[in-house]
Amino acid sequence: KETAFVEVVLFESSPSGDYTTYTTGLTGRFSRAGATLSAEGEIVQMHPLGLCNNNDEEDLYEYGWVGVVKLEQPELDPKPCLTVLGKAKRAVQRGATAVIFDVSENPEAIDQLNQGSEDPLKRPVVYVKGADAIKLMNIVNKQKVARARIQHRPPRQPTEYFDM
């Protein structure tokens, strides 16, 4: 299980009216459920139940976003509509370029994501926990537009990838 280096760039409007970017680095793990490769896109917070819904399945999708899913305690959802892997698969089917799971409340999900799948997704499925998950969710919950870049090697300089 390789380390996933995640850079999160937040777009903030400055008093002068320009957009300023703030970069935060955190680490997670690439799971065996997906590919170990780089991905980048706007962060889209997805509720676990939001991935249950079937009524978007005939849609044309928008691509290139990074789904962030905070998993709940298993007791709160004893009969989930989909497995964690199923949720990752659905997000990718809907156009996600990567999926990041916050597994802090549901550490058993790590094993589910790392069961050697015969048919892993072609996009990265990353999990974060602890301080890194808190950092990520604090940004996601800010109600700001943010972009994530996932890498499988440490970024050399935060500014290198976001030439804003």
Epitope: F11, Y19, N53, L60, E62, V140, Q143, V145
Partner: antibody, heavy 116, light 107 residues
Amino acid sequence: EVQLVESGGGLVQPGESLKLSCSASGFTFSNYGMHWIRQVPGKGLDWVAYISNSGGSLYADAVKGRFTISRDNAKNTLYLELNSLKSEDTAIYHCARGYSYPGPYWGQGTLVTVSS
Amino acid sequence: DIQVTQSPSSLLASLGERVTITCQTGQSINNYLNWYQQRPGQAPLLLIYFATSLQTGVPSRFSGQYSGRSFTLTITSLEPEDIANYFCLQHYSPPYTFGAGTKLELR
């Protein structure tokens, strides 16, 4: 079937306000980001504003501080509040679904005319 | 703001001809550029996203390429229904910006 229907356009005087709506159906509205794009008839496209599914917003320089994008997920509706309107805001305003870009689904638009 | 320069502003072409439209950006935007088609009286239609990816349902005669800050939309063999206006959009850095458009007409 995905549908986006704009309303609320009309004729207003410079300095006045207007609130546009975009009613969405055929998809889980709360899962998606939404954009407003405007077009002076016969001219080019102008990106106006974006709201993410979690409520974060971005604006074009020309409208920042005057226009406000918002959404009501319970009503499956996107809004654009236009204040301190200027004659150069005259355009057809389209809503479109998408995250960092307006995707394959656009509404037909509602015409805003600012004139004295 | 990132400047997007689209050329040509208008273009005369014959049916079956190969057509190329270019957008140049003022700074690097990776591949964050889309192409849209707009026929008279209609809403724009997404053709290409992330510079090279063909939107589902769009004919394969449309393609996108890029090199550095230069992006091209190519129609390999012009069909009557391709007569329209074409716009590019950079969505790398807000505020997002469209090119001024290219009006494609039949010769």
